[in-house]
């Protein structure tokens, strides 16, 4: 009976519940299309449990399949602005190590001012995710409009 | 020793697999921008396992980090309608308790007739989530076009 | 010793961590609006752990509540193209067994070239999911622009 019950048990730390939700800190200097992120309870509702930030980019600490999601809203934007400044594109990818560099998720704004998407993807310890926003429009820093996160799903 | 080890254990049923997927019931009366939701197998493919509905708003029963997702499609809508009735905006937030009131996720329709997004956010037992649709356009009640849900991810 | 070890164990396969992320293979022949998917490490970052492909359609192997997500980007598309070719619609549904046929998620492109969404839905072993793209525009096969996946969430 005790044994059967024990089979139901699972150590919390082994569940691999790595998760992070980030808010926008700032955009990069000229010629750097990357968005720089920040996270932590002091900043509001963003957090990092497992992954870490490395100069504003998200670094993975545990191998596995992750759900990656992002929403970016352009500031001072209307459908007219968005189409006039087209193409404005957001790409999420592994940017380091260089040997694993790949684009994971890409969206264009067209006549909209917000993009939002999500996908499952395998990530490895040490992978750093970069989010590149190309175009002349600036992202909103409102925490309910622009955010980026990952959630470990399975080994 | 036994006690320390027991602390590491987590019974499967206590994993906090709280989850809900809701379908639109109705919009609010004048001056009330909230959408009112319903859920349950008798209604189709909507359900509540853990969270509850309180007058059409979703109330959380377990502390943790949740994935919140939503899709809202406007009824009788074309890109012309959407731009003519702009701004139409959807915001998901904690509306009670008042001390925790905050907007979690916000999107505008611009020239589109559907918004869809998701994010990770910490929620606490007793938090009630409200979804506010501002503007004059009406949401579709088709269950494959408009839905709102949460999924407990980790403590 | 065996007993202590047993406490640590929860067989991975019993966790129900069924998950799949697919990339577009091809569109259907005339009069067949379905998208045909493919997955596997040899193809890049797509994979199937649990679910299977049946003639390019995703078949579920484990009962439960799933998070279903999709992104489809139209190829050779601008907001002008999208509006000129409207209506272009993407629907994800259970297409077999016929007794369980239902649309789960539906989006129109309007003036945009990408749709992305996700939802929670109960699925049963043997359910086959189909993704129907209606209209004359073609989807991009870039793996960061068009993808479809499911993730088992709870029993």
């Amino acid at each position: 009976q005790r044994f059967a019950q024990a089979q139901q048990q699972l150590p919390l730390e082994s569940l691999g519940w790595d998760v992070a939700e980030l808010q926008l800190n700032h955009t990069g200097p000229q010629q750097d299309p990357r968005l720089y992120w920040q996270g932590g309870p002091a900043l509001g509702r963003s957090f990092l449990h497992g992954p870490e930030l490395d100069k504003g980019q998200l670094r993975i600490h545990r191998d596995g399949i992750y759900m990656v999601h992002i929403q970016v809203t352009l500031a001072i934007c209307s459908s007219t602005t968005a189409s006039r400044h087209h193409p404005t594109t957001l790409a999420v990818g592994i940017c380091s190590p260089a040997s694993r560099s790949i684009s994971l998720l890409r969206l264009s704004f067209h006549q909209g001012c917000t993009i939002a998407s999500q996908r499952l993807t395998p990530l490895a310890r040490g992978d750093t995710l970069c989010t590149n926003l190309t175009g002349t429009l600036l992202p909103s820093r409102n925490t309910d409009e622009t955010f980026f996160g990952v959630q470990w799903v399975r080994p | 020793q036994r006690f320390a080890q027991a602390q590491q254990q987590l019974p499967l049923e206590s994993l906090g697999w709280d989850v809900a997927e809701l379908q639109l019931n109705h919009t609010g009366p004048q001056q009330d921008p909230r959408l009112y939701w319903q859920g349950g197998p008798a209604l189709g493919r909507s359900f509540l396992h853990g969270p509850e509905l309180d007058k059409g708003q979703l109330r959380i029963h377990r502390d943790g980090i949740y994935m919140v997702h939503i899709q809202v499609t406007l009824a009788i809508c074309s890109s012309t309608t959407a731009s003519r009735h702009h701004p139409t905006t959807l915001a998901v937030g904690i509306c009670s308790p008042a001390s925790r009131s905050i907007s979690l996720l916000r999107l505008s329709f611009h020239q589109g007739c559907t918004i869809a997004s998701q994010r990770l956010t910490p929620l606490a037992r007793g938090d009630t989530l409200c979804t506010n649709l501002t503007g004059t356009l009406l949401p579709s009640r088709n269950t494959d076009e408009t839905f709102f849900g949460v999924q407990w991810v980790r403590p | 010793q065996r007993f202590a070890q047993a406490q640590q164990q929860l067989p991975l396969e019993s966790l129900g961590w069924d998950v799949a992320e697919l990339q577009l293979n091809h569109t259907g022949p005339q009069q067949d609006p379905r998208l045909y998917w493919q997955g596997g490490p040899a193809l890049g970052r797509s994979f199937l752990h649990g679910p299977e492909l049946d003639k390019g359609q995703l078949r579920i192997h484990r009962d439960g509540i799933y998070m279903v997500h999709i992104q489809v980007t139209l190829a050779i598309c601008s907001s002008t193209t999208a509006s000129r070719h409207h209506p272009t619609t993407l629907a994800v549904g259970i297409c077999s067994p016929a007794s369980r046929s239902i649309s789960l998620l539906r989006l129109s492109f309007h003036q945009g070239c990408t749709i992305a969404s996700q939802r929670l839905t109960p699925l049963a072993r043997g359910d086959t999911l189909c993704t129907n793209l209606t209209g004359t525009l073609l989807p991009s096969r870039n793996t960061d622009e068009t993808f479809f996946g499911v993730q088992w969430v709870r029993p």
Epitope: - | N25, H26, T27, G28, P29, Q30, Q31, D32, A75, I76, C77, S78, T80, T81, T136, L137, L138, S140, R141, N142 | H86, P87, T89, S108
Partner: antibody, heavy 120, light 107 residues
Framework: EVQLLESGGGLVQPGGSLRLSCAAS????????MSWVRQAPGKGLEWVST????????FYADSVMGRFTISRDNSKNTLYLQMNSLRAEDTAVYYC?????????????WGQGTLVTVSS | EIVLTQSPATLSVSPGERATLSCRAS??????LAWYQQKPGQAPRLLIY???SRATGIPDRFSGSGSGTDFTLTISSLQAEDVAVYYC?????????FGPGTKVEIK
């Protein structure tokens, strides 16, 4: 059985006002959007106005915008159309119609109509 | 606004024969189109919605087809009780608009 019964029609002079009512029964009135559709004698159908299930949103045809007001009292299961500054071209049979539940779109049930005549 | 045109204005068909009514939209309305039947002195009655779905209680001799801008209502075997005016209506965007109607009579 779904029933919609219009009342309040009659003869009115140009520039005058009239208030139409539609009493609903046989369904949960508060969960359906409702509309008024009119039909001039010997002519086709013309949509006039729509109100959402809760009354929070209203829509009007350009031809009546600013002159007509749609409203509802869900506690009384009644739909109203307040018509001001009436013109000869407003002469028609006015139908109260229920929208489909899902999409505020087509009209799945209609009343028998009430005749409004605007004439001096 | 979206303009709907119906043809023919009048259709004379022998009992038991097929009647085919056409409705064309000035721009695409996807499948957001309904058909109504109105008999003399009566209110309209919903026949078809979503371009091809039959409303509750409608006999299966009535069928709808089409999407985008061109739609068809077919009465496979005309009965005496089908004599009426038939209207199409788009609900793709407001203002909702109706076609001018097709009068169906017995030849």
């Amino acid at each position: 059985e779904v029933q919609l019964l219009e009342s309040g029609g009659g003869l009115v002079q140009p520039g005058g006002s009239l208030r139409l009512s539609c009493a609903a029964s046989g369904f949960t009135f508060s969960t359906y959007a409702m509309s008024w559709v009119r039909q001039a004698p010997g002519k086709g159908l013309e949509w006039v106005s729509t109100i959402s299930d809760s009354g929070g949103s209203t829509f009007y045809a350009d031809s009546v915008m600013g002159r007509f007001t749609i409203s509802r009292d869900n506690s009384k299961n009644t739909l109203y159309l307040q018509m001001n500054s009436l013109r000869a071209e407003d002469t028609a049979v006015y139908y109260c119609a229920r929208h489909d539940y899902s999409n505020y779109a087509f009209f799945d049930y209609w009343g028998q109509g009430t005749l409004v005549t605007v004439s001096s | 606004e979206i303009v709907l045109t119906q043809s023919p204005a009048t259709l004379s068909v022998s009992p038991g024969e097929r009647a085919t009514l056409s409705c064309r939209a000035s721009q695409s309305v996807s499948s957001n189109l309904a058909w109504y039947q109105q008999k003399p002195g009566q209110a309209p009655r919903l026949l078809i919605y979503g371009a091809s779905s039959r409303a509750t209680g409608i006999p299966d001799r009535f069928s709808g087809s089409g999407s985008g801008t061109d739609f068809t209502l077919t009465i496979s075997s005309l009965q005496a009780e089908d004599v009426a005016v038939y209207y199409c209506q788009q609900y793709y965007s407001t203002p909702f608009t109706f076609g001018p109607g097709t009068k169906v009579e017995i030849k």
